[in-house]
């Protein structure tokens, strides 16, 4: 299953399959997730080791048993790959690292006014993988405001150095934020020239294209079909690059197919997995296990659940079958692709779905209406769980926020439905940033069921929580995916990085905002919060957040939206915007429904008809 916990001051011994430099443990974990063999990783921050060569070292590891012995190492961080973790799987990494220079091949230098502008340039440059920016206070005046665009053979820095007044980060192309745009066309009977960066075997050009998309240096590809004239080259997928970023030439060639990486697509990237099943095809590789199962779909599920399994073949040969069950061969290889592909067999083959974003149909559970005051504009895909709950009567207007917690579930505040319990009048917009982008043609979700907490009473602050079941499940994308829920009764975690988001008023007597606003707000203990509300009881089912001096808060229209906190690189839904005394007033924290206290209720209500939980805890 999905294991998200990180181990501080621990290092996994042995099992090394690759090593690289990464700026933090979260990026190391992401590289492990996308590495075909990596199950575990260990990361050495700069502070944890004197050896300059091992600083920022990210060590990817495999283990037949799925675990390795941990040794104590001060400062080290270890953890698991996020394979099998559904919507948490993403190659998108937005963080900017201050005081760090990520080294690589510098291929472009320009003057820019901010690190965000530098990141944008990298994202809009086809070859840029990461960048470094020298701030206005950099010690050498001639380098100040320099934006260096970089790449490397592996897509990760060739070295990382601590350097004052330098900020570094990665391209946001994997976040589907590139302005370049992409070529979706597949070119039949055409071969591209230029430099081969890798060679793998794939059953078709679509798998080849997805592998190219997620390969750090692949910009385009050529695939040789299973009837290509040279037998040894059949099903070969050649991943390619060039100096210019486009093929310098193409040759008409029977039984070849070419195309481009989809990494530069805007708003939508292919999933990093291959769900198609190939009848009459055998995939060869190292045998992991053989099991008897009923049907090829069950074989694929078995492969997906066995974390080391990369691909499978389901044999229908009479000697491989017993009654209704046949042999399911679970296999793996060094690069994650079959070592041999054979056609015209009595088998069916396919890939593990361990890297599919959708995962199973689960949710990740790891007094006055309120809004965002003192916030700033959000950017695309920054808060992909945020939804807008809108009511259409004569006109249509935004009323509340909400959080996507599963394909078919939104969590919000019960008070959003005070006086408006009719599900037909509501429209739920997900994957949006600007309310002005909504037109009559913008797709929206309708409500199948509104589940208000049984102890909620209108105009009271207690039990202000409601679930919305959508009429149809939503697909996950970089801009529309769920937030993890906390563990039940999560009281021990100390959250220090919390944000509230919404389109609500930007001042107490204001109006709904067009661009989704965000504000970083510290949590306040319930004891402190209680002292500031002389008339209302702050229960253990509430959590408070706010600044002593005020100025930043949620406001009218933010109700029902998320209070999320980042812990160990993972965002969790800690609170639901509920109520407060005005907005952003001095010494009056916002009050939020504490999600951890309602986990039993959430899990009970989201049980599907077959009794399978629709959400799961990250822990």
């Amino acid at each position: 299953g999905c294991l998200t916990q990180l181990y501080e001051n621990a290092f996994f011994r042995g099992g090394d399959v690759a090593s690289m430099y990464t700026p933090n443990a979260q990026y190391c974990q992401m590289r492990c997730t996308f590495h075909p063999r990596c199950l575990l990783f260990s990361f050495l921050p700069a502070s944890s080791i004197n050896d300059m060569e091992k600083r920022f070292g990210c060590f990817l590891k495999d283990s037949v048993t799925g675990t390795l012995p941990k040794v104590h190492r001060t400062g080290a961080v270890s953890g698991h790959s996020l394979k099998q973790c559904g919507h948490q799987i993403s190659a998108c990494h937005r963080d900017i690292y201050k005081g760090v220079d990520m080294r690589g091949v510098n291929f472009n230098v320009s003057k820019v006014s901010s690190v965000e502008e530098c990141q944008k340039r990298c994202t809009s440059n086809i070859r840029c993988q990461f960048f470094s920016y020298a701030t206005q206070t950099f010690h050498k005046a001639e380098y100040r405001n320099n934006c260096l665009l970089k790449y490397s053979p592996g897509g990760t820095p060739t070295a990382i150095k601590v350097l004052s007044n330098v900020e570094s980060g990665f391209s946001l192309k994997p976040c589907a934020l590139s302005e370049i745009g992409c070529h979706m066309n597949i070119f039949q009977h055409l071969a591209f020239s230029d430099v081969d960066v890798a060679r793998v075997l794939t059953p078709d050009a679509f798998v080849c294209r997805t592998i190219c998309t997620y390969h750090p240096n692949c910009l385009f590809f050529t695939f040789y079909t299973n009837v290509w004239k040279i037998e040894s080259q059949r099903n070969v997928c050649l991943l390619k690059t060039s100096e210019s970023g486009t093929p310098s030439s193409s040759t008409p060639q029977e039984n070849t197919i070419s195309g481009y990486s989809l990494l530069t697509c805007k708003r939508t990237l292919p999933e990093p997995c291959h769900s198609k099943i190939y009848p009459g095809v055998d995939f060869g590789g190292e045998e992991l296990n053989v099991t008897f199962v009923k049907g090829v779909n069950v074989c694929q599920e078995t492969c997906t659940k066995m974390i080391r399994c990369q691909f499978f073949t389901y044999s229908l040969l009479p000697e491989d079958c017993k009654e209704e069950k046949c042999k399911c061969f679970l296999r793996l290889s060094m690069d994650g692709s079959p070592t041999r592909i054979a056609y015209g067999t009595q088998g069916s083959s396919g890939y593990s779905l361990r890297l599919c974003n959708t995962g199973d149909n689960s949710v990740c559970t790891t007094k006055t209406s309120t809004r965002i005051v003192g916030g700033t504009n959000s950017s695309w895909g920054e808060w992909p769980w945020q939804v807008s709950l809108q009511v259409k009567l004569t006109a249509q207007r935004h009323l509340c926020g909400g959080s996507l917690i599963g394909h078919q579930w939104v969590l919000t505040a019960a008070h959003c439905f005070d006086g408006l319990p009719l599900q037909d009048v509501w429209r739920i917009y997900s994957g949006i940033l600007n309310l002005s982008d909504i037109t009559k043609d913008t797709p929206f979700s309708q409500i199948k069921e509104i589940i208000i907490h049984q102890n909620y009473k209108v105009s009271e602050g207690n039990h202000d929580i409601a679930l919305i079941k959508l009429q149809a499940p939503l697909n996950y994308t970089e801009f529309q995916k769920p937030i993890c829920l906390p563990s039940k009764g999560d009281t021990s975690t100390i959250y220090t990085n919390c944000w509230v988001t919404g389109w609500g008023f930007s001042k107490e007597k204001g109006e709904i905002q067009n661009i989704l606003q965000k504000v970083n707000i510290p949590l306040v203990t319930n004891e402190e919060c209680q002292k500031r509300y002389q008339d209302y009881k702050i229960t253990q089912r509430m959590v408070c957040a706010g600044y002593k001096e005020g100025g930043k808060d949620a406001c009218k229209g933010d109700s029902g939206g998320p209070l999320v906190c980042k812990h160990n690189g993972m965002w969790r839904l800690v609170g639901i915007t509920s109520w407060g005394e005005g907005c952003a007033r001095r010494e009056q924290p916002g009050v939020y429904t504490k999600v951890a206290e309602y986990m039993d209720w959430i899990l009970e209500k989201t049980q599907s008809s077959d009794g399978k939980a629709q959400m799961q805890s990250p822990a």
Epitope: Q530, Q534, D535
Partner: antibody, heavy 116, light 106 residues
Framework: EVQLQQSGAELVKPGASVRLSCTAS????????IFWVKQRPKQGLEWIGR????????KYDPKIQGKATLTADTSSNTAYLQLSSLTSEDSAIYYC?????????WGQGTLVSVSA | DIQMTQSPSAMSASVGDRVTITCEAS??????IAWYQQKPGKAPKLLIY???TLQSGVPSRFSGSGSGTEFTLTISNLQPEDFATYYC????????FGQGTKVEIK
């Protein structure tokens, strides 16, 4: 309208016990805290304790030392103050009050007279 | 335990006067002080909380100030209905009242 109705005056003998009630209307006591405050004749106010009727969690003034016991019955929306081993020092008006961080709304008070 | 020392214990004033009552805490109470007014035979009434926040419905002639351990209640234009006893209350650590200040007609 928020109201706290306290029980009537009590005349009790030294060493005896007494139970005072505070019945709420206009709100549910589970949604608030109930506080008790003592005021001796011609003297100031003293906080006795606080109960959270939702879970019966209580806090007392450390000086009370078992003199007072706070309880609540959510079905009747009533809070109680039990005073034991009464002495003349316990003769006072006892107020119940509701609130969050402090006492926002008060009952009318109950006079307890301890006399042989 | 936090002690609250209120002064004066009694004072005489006339309608229209500016009246100041002080409360000193034995420790820093982080501005968690409230002021109550009590009239004979009646329950106390909350006037001000968190040093200076006026409870709704309380006239604006009442104001509170202070920080750390020194706090003040001011009635800027004393009205006939303001003759009463005033109590401070610290609620930073449990609850402690001051001894009270009786404001009488001169």
């Amino acid at each position: 309208e928020v109201q706290l109705q306290q029980s009537g005056a009590e005349l009790v003998k030294p060493g005896a016990s007494v139970r005072l009630s505070c019945t709420a209307s206009g709100f549910n006591i589970k949604d608030t805290y109930i506080f008790w405050v003592k005021q001796r004749p011609k003297q100031g106010l003293e906080w006795i304790g606080r109960i959270d009727p939702e879970n019966d969690n209580t806090k007392y003034d450390p000086k009370i030392q078992g003199k007072a016991t706070l309880t609540a019955d959510t079905s009747s929306n009533t809070a109680y103050l039990q005073l034991s081993s009464l002495t003349s020092e316990d003769s006072a008006i006892y107020y119940c009050a509701k609130g969050g961080g402090l006492f926002a709304y008060w009952g009318q008070g109950t006079l307890v007279s301890v006399s042989a | 335990d936090i002690q609250m020392t209120q002064s004066p214990s009694a004072m005489s004033a006339s309608v229209g006067d500016r009246v100041t009552i002080t409360c000193e805490a034995s420790h820093d109470i982080n501005n968690y002080i409230a002021w109550y007014q009590q009239k004979p035979g009646k329950a106390p009434k909350l006037l001000i909380y968190y040093t200076s926040t006026l409870q709704s419905g309380v006239p604006s002639r009442f104001s509170g100030s202070g920080s750390g351990t020194e706090f003040t209640l001011t009635i800027s234009n004393l009205q006939p209905e303001d003759f009463a006893t005033y109590y401070c209350l610290q609620y930073d650590n449990l609850f402690t009242f001051g001894q009270g200040t009786k404001v009488e007609i001169k």
